[in-house]
Interface confidence: low
């Protein structure tokens, strides 16, 4: 025939490793690993007596043997001598040759072995037992689908501690690879199935399969032996190989006393949940008394700087010099200057109202029998009394991430009734870009520019470009009641030592170019927006109507430089949803209190200011707003 | 997508020689195997010939050894398969089709998993 | 060569049918079997290779299995688009790969 012709050449001409067509012997295997398995039994027509594969194995991927059975063949003469034959395929080929077995005995009897020399690791093979000249067996197979490699070697144990109780120990189980496994240079990476159990039980705990030549065996029960032994697999294919000799682990009493059943104190967890416990009702007392604790640590100073003397001379306490400089000014008592460098901020804290009935350090700095407004003071002044937070050690260092929010401003969040308060900086040459120059007041909410990484950015203002500015009033919900001045600015000092304050109050932010009506505006409408405010929440309940346009006279010293401005935007949503805070009261003005002389000195930090220079519409307005702290000040006063 | 194409069939008198063609895509012609097969009208398949590009190993049926040739052209990803002295019951659709050892689950199979079209050859005078 | 015995020649069934085509090998040829399904005008299509494995893409309704030196292809619910012409092949080298003559299953 043309084809064996063709098949003896090809052989002849060397191609017998790399010529790897192939027979269709192909027996179909379960998913189980075949090389275990006998042939399906489907796939017989001869008896179960005839001479069938066993299992074909490769312990290291480098050769492999095959193993058949020959139960009664030794005591029959019928048939022929068994023979196996091979092949490798090329998954593209369809026919090739049949090679005989190339070693009938280092593997033992019935078995057929595969030095590397016939060994491929990437060609499937076909095997096929003949006898008489007639197939009674076949196998296909890749290398990798056969690897079973040899069992781990060298076993042994280290206790690794021992339980509180003296009643369970660990231990580390090592061991060695096989020889003949090719672990350093990756050619079989191996993975490990630990088995143990005591001697006297009947089932093998198994362990996860693991990667190493170690691992922890935990909980064994002292004054126990365990039997200990590992297999291992080539990692992602074949079969696991037999299983390491056992290793024996006796594990001595080691405590006083025995108990007959698992005695488990468990410390660990007791201290774990312990500690867990603390933590939770530290931060859920921390939480609940955050702005009474703030108010401890941080007490109420704001501190107000005198226009136009150094801050040393304050520190220092030179009265005369002092006297002498405002001596010097005579004519000066400006209206304030609400673009002034010197503004020192404030940070405003909203408490819950439970937390309003009980009095705060800052009723206590305010407080004379006549004159207590508990339920009122619903800001808080949480400035710590350290230097301006115009200076750059403080715009770099030292903000508080919880007291930046993520870029959006308070008065879009009025679910938010408490938090800290929004250092932010309007960049007033900037304002024709800000979102509240050509947005109507009545439709535009107001929002806030975050400075880049969540700092605030000095920015400088251009208040000496115009002497007389109009403070255009815009107009807000009181959830928004976060951008008026009201700050007492030092102006005078009597020679007697008295100190004489002036009210300031400027819209420092973007003019709206959109006209304001000509009546009457309520404090409780939408976008009121002024920045540098303090805004106590008992003003924000009053809904105070304002005349829509407020000239204040900006006299402007050129000595004076024009610093930085920094604002705070706070929610003051408390205020927001009180009822009854609409009421219209035509003709009014908006009142601006004048603090002209200090009323009490009560301690080093505070003062009691006298508001004489407006009439207000409710006394609780000065009770709650009328107050100036500062750690300068007390040191020129007698 | 493997795809197989045919052509260079015809009508061709006894006796007489015709050559098809069969051009393959979407694999690696060089490591295939490819088979004619053909189908006589109303009749069940019959396999031809086939040749394995990578080793050059060729095989006949019986009943066209020493009158047709298969050939492949490894640059043009095609094969051939040259009629000679044709007979009248080589008429026929003639299948060009991919030989391949399936591999799944441990089981093996040569089959053929692509075909072509075919093409029509008739042998009549 | 081996010769692929196909029976029966055709048959009729309805859809929904359990249907069952043999094909007996003139010798042992392993499980190196094939089975085709061929509609008129059309190239045939693989369904079954070594016996029994469903080839990808074939509907799970058609199987393949072995008994010695038989094979059967069964469709366990007949439908519309099964109508056609079934052959099996053997592969069994070094011999000539040999097909049975064919089923044809038509619509009862």
């Known amino acids: 025939m043309d084809l064996w012709q063709l098949l003896l050449t090809l052989a002849l001409a060397g191609s017998s490793d790399a010529f790897s067509g192939s027979e269709a012997t192909a027996a179909i295997l379960s998913r189980a690993p075949w090389s275990l398995q006998s042939v399906n039994p489907g796939l017989k027509t001869n008896s179960s007596k005839e001479p069938k594969f066993t299992k074909c194995r490769s312990p290291e991927r480098e050769t492999f043997s095959c193993h058949w059975t020959d139960e009664v063949h030794h005591g029959t003469k019928n048939l022929g001598p068994i023979q196996l034959f091979y092949t490798r395929r090329n998954t593209q080929e369809w026919t090739q040759e049949w090679k005989e077995c190339p070693d009938y005995v280092s593997a033992g009897e019935n078995s057929c072995y595969f030095n590397s020399s016939f060994t491929s690791i990437w060609i499937p093979y076909c095997i096929k037992l003949t006898s008489n000249g007639g197939t009674v067996d076949e196998k296909c197979f890749s290398v990798d689908e056969i690897v079973q490699p040899d069992p781990p070697i060298a076993l042994n144990w280290t206790l690794l501690n021992v339980s509180l109780t003296g009643i369970h120990a660990d231990i580390q189980v090592r061991w060695e690879a096989p020889r003949n496994a090719d672990i350093q240079k990756g050619w079989m990476v191996l993975e490990y199935e630990l088995q143990y159990k005591e001697v006297n039980e009947t089932k093998w705990k198994m362990m996860d399969p693991i990667l190493t030549t170690s691992v922890p065996v935990y909980s064994l029960k002292v004054d126990k032996e365990y039997e200990v032994r590992v297999r291992s697999k080539q990692r992602n294919s074949g079969n696991y190989g037999e299983f390491s000799e056992v290793l024996y682990v006796t594990l001595p009493q080691m405590s006083q006393f025995t108990c007959e059943e698992d005695f488990y104190f468990p410390w660990l967890l007791i201290i774990i949940f312990g500690i867990f416990g603390l933590t939770v009702m530290l931060f859920v007392f921390l939480f609940s008394k955050q702005q009474r604790i703030k108010m401890l640590i941080l007490p109420p100073v704001p501190v107000p700087k005198i226009k136009g003397i150094d801050p040393d001379l304050l520190k220092e306490g030179k009265l005369e010099e002092v006297n002498t400089i405002l001596a010097i000014h005579d004519s000066y008592k400006p209206e304030f200057h609400s673009d002034d460098s010197w503004v020192e901020f404030i940070e405003l804290d909203i408490d819950e109202p439970d937390e309003k009935t009980e009095e705060s350090d800052t009723d206590r700095l305010l407080s004379s029998d006549h004159e207590k407004s508990h339920s009122n003071l619903g800001v808080k002044d949480g400035d710590s009394g350290r230097t301006s937070c115009c200076e750059p050690d403080i715009l770099e260092t030292d903000f508080n991430a919880n007291d930046i929010h993520e870029g959006t401003s308070e008065v879009a969040q009025p679910q938010r009734l408490k938090g800290e308060a929004d250092l932010l900086c309007l960049d007033q040459k900037n304002q024709n870009n800000s979102p509240y120059h050509d947005a109507c007041p009545a439709t535009q909410q107001p929002s806030v520019i975050q400075a880049e990484k969540n700092k605030p950015q000095p920015l400088p203002t251009e208040g000496a470009e115009s002497t007389h500015q109009a403070a255009h009033i815009q107009l807000s919900n009181p959830s928004s009641l976060s951008n008026i001045d009201f700050y007492a600015q030092v102006s005078d000092i009597t020679p007697a030592g008295s100190v004489v304050l002036s009210p300031g109050q400027k819209n420092k932010a973007g003019m709206s170019q959109c006209d304001m009506h000509p009546e009457m505006v309520s404090l409780c409408q939408e976008n009121f927006l002024m920045d540098n405010a303090y805004f106590c929440e008992a003003d924000a309940k009053k809904c105070i109507p304002v005349a829509p346009h407020i000239k204040v006279e900006s006299h402007i010293q050129p000595s004076l430089n024009q610093e930085d401005i920094y604002i705070t935007t706070e929610s003051l949503t408390t205020a927001a949803g009180r009822p009854g805070t609409g009421e219209h009261v035509p003709g009014s003005e908006m009142p601006v209190p004048d603090y002209t002389s200090i009323h009490i000195v009560q301690s080093p930090q505070g003062l009691i200011l006298n508001a004489t220079a407006l009439p207000l519409p409710d006394k609780e307005f000065l009770s709650s707003c009328g107050y100036v702290s500062t750690d300068q000040l007390n040191k020129i006063m007698p | 997508e493997v795809q197989l194409v045919e052509s260079g069939g015809g009508l061709v008198q006894p006796g007489g020689s015709l050559r098809l063609s069969c051009a393959a895509s979407?694999?690696?012609?060089?490591?295939?195997?490819i088979h004619w097969v053909r189908q006589a009208p109303g009749k069940g398949l019959e396999w031809v010939a086939y040749?394995?590009?990578?080793?050059?190993?060729?095989s006949y049926a019986d009943s066209v050894k020493g009158r047709f040739t298969i050939s492949a052209d490894t640059s043009k990803n095609t094969a051939y398969l040259q009629m000679n002295s044709l007979r009248a019951e080589d008429t026929a659709v003639y299948y060009c089709?991919?030989?391949?050892?399936?591999?799944?689950?441990?089981?093996?199979?040569?089959?053929?998993?692509?075909w072509g079209q075919g093409t029509l050859v008739t042998v009549s005078s | 060569d081996i010769q692929m015995t196909q029976s029966p020649s055709s048959l009729s069934a309805s859809v929904g049918d359990r249907v069952t085509i043999t094909c007996r090998a003139s010798?042992?040829?392993?499980?190196?079997v094939a089975w085709y399904q061929q509609k008129p005008g059309k190239a045939p299509k693989l369904l079954i290779y070594?016996?029994?494995s469903l080839y990808s893409g074939v509907p799970s309704r058609f199987s393949g299995s072995r008994s010695g030196t038989d094979f059967t292809l069964t469709i366990s619910s007949l439908q519309p688009e099964d109508f056609a012409t079934y052959y099996c092949?053997?592969?069994?080298?070094?011999?000539?790969?040999?097909f049975g003559q064919g089923t044809k299953v038509e619509i009862k």
């Open positions: 010798q042992s040829v392993s499980s190196a």
């Open positions: 040749i394995s590009s990578y080793y050059g190993s060729t």
């Open positions: 089709a991919r030989g391949y050892w399936i591999y799944y689950q441990y089981a093996w199979g040569y089959a053929f998993d692509y």
């Open positions: 092949q053997q592969s069994y080298g070094p011999y000539p790969l040999t």
């Open positions: 070594s016996a029994s």
């Open positions: 979407g694999f690696n012609f060089s490591y295939s195997s």
